[in-house]
């Protein structure tokens, strides 16, 4: 005996109560594939969630997070509070990064500044809570007498002003 349910398209369900008739999904429900025996209830984007895409008879709603929060997990299953740059989220809320660490985003944890000396380089720009250090040439490159990649500027003749 052929299963008539396999003929039911997305957006409908196979209603066993009505001799396997394909019935449309009611409002606030959907079926994303054919041959379904139920319609799934649409996801509700409430509270810290806001609707990014409305539910339709063939696809679930998609949620985003309201301002001040960001999505976590598959399909934005959670919303996590934003912090400012230079902070990280702890159980007690947003806390400033400790000295020697930085966070240049509104999410995530504070990460240690780059240790320039591990690459044999020197610190060109100091790190802050919001920014990593900028590593420059190695100390050896900066020592007197070291060859420079840029040629010296030409000497001006005395008594001539620059053009």
């Amino acid at each position: 005996l052929q299963d008539l349910c396999s003929n039911c398209p997305a957006g409908t369900f196979c209603d066993n109560n009505r001799s396997q008739i394909c019935s449309p999904c009611p409002p606030n429900s959907f079926s994303s594939a054919g041959g379904q025996r139920t319609c799934d209830i649409c996801r509700q984007c409430k509270g810290v969630f806001k609707t990014r895409k409305e539910c339709s008879s063939t696809s679930n709603a998609e949620c985003d997070c309201i301002s001040g929060y960001h999505c976590l997990g598959a399909e934005c299953s959670m919303c996590e509070q934003d912090c400012k740059q230079g902070q990280e989220l702890t159980k007690k809320g947003c806390k400033d990064c400790c000295f020697g660490t930085f966070n240049d985003q509104k999410r995530g944890i504070c990460r240690p500044w780059t240790n320039c000396s591990l690459d044999g380089k020197s610190v060109l720009v100091n790190g802050t809570k919001e920014r990593d250090v900028v590593c420059g040439p190695s100390p050896a490159d900066l020592s007197p007498g070291a060859s420079s990649a840029t040629p010296p500027a030409p000497a001006r003749e005395p008594g001539h002003s620059p053009q």
């Epitope: 369900f13 066993n16 109560n17 019935s23 429900s29 025996r37 139920t38 319609c39 799934d40 209830i41």
Partner: nanobody
Framework: EVQLVETGGGLIQPGGSLRLSCAAS????????MSWVRQAPGKGLEWVSV???????YYADSVKGRFTISRDNSKNTLYLQMNSLRAEDTAVYYC????????????????????RGQGTTVTVSS
């Protein structure tokens, strides 16, 4: 005996309003998921609106902003207020008790009507 009886249909001009009632007996409307569906001449069943046990309401796009589903718990009655009626709203309107999987106010899936009334006819014509 579980029963649903719809009333309030009739002939109405385009732009007019009607209120359909659905009196339930043998069960409590407020603790069930209830809906209005309609069947236009020569067409299949079309969903109109659903009200969940927690009072959440949902509508088909074709009636959104014009129709309102509600219930009166003391009268054990379901209502459908229909405003700005159009010729395409002409149909037999049925109220129904729905079957959902899931507990309490948080259903996860719908799997069909379990009780349906005999229907009331709404004709929108000038």
């Amino acid at each position: 005996e579980v029963q649903l009886v719809e009333t309030g249909g009739g002939l109405i001009q385009p732009g007019g309003s009607l209120r359909l009632s659905c009196a339930a007996s043998g069960f409590t409307v407020s603790s069930n998921y209830m809906s209005w569906v309609r069947q236009a001449p020569g067409k299949g069943l079309e969903w109109v609106s659903v009200i969940y046990s927690d009072g959440s309401t949902y509508y088909a796009d074709s009636v959104k902003g014009r129709f309102t589903i509600s219930r009166d718990n003391s009268k054990n009655t379901l209502y459908l207020q229909m405003n700005s009626l159009r010729a395409e709203d002409t149909a037999v309107y049925y109220c129904a008790r729905d079957r959902y999987y899931g507990s309490g106010n948080y259903p996860t899936a719908y799997y069909g009507m379990d009780v349906r009334g005999q229907g009331t006819t709404v004709t929108v014509s000038s």
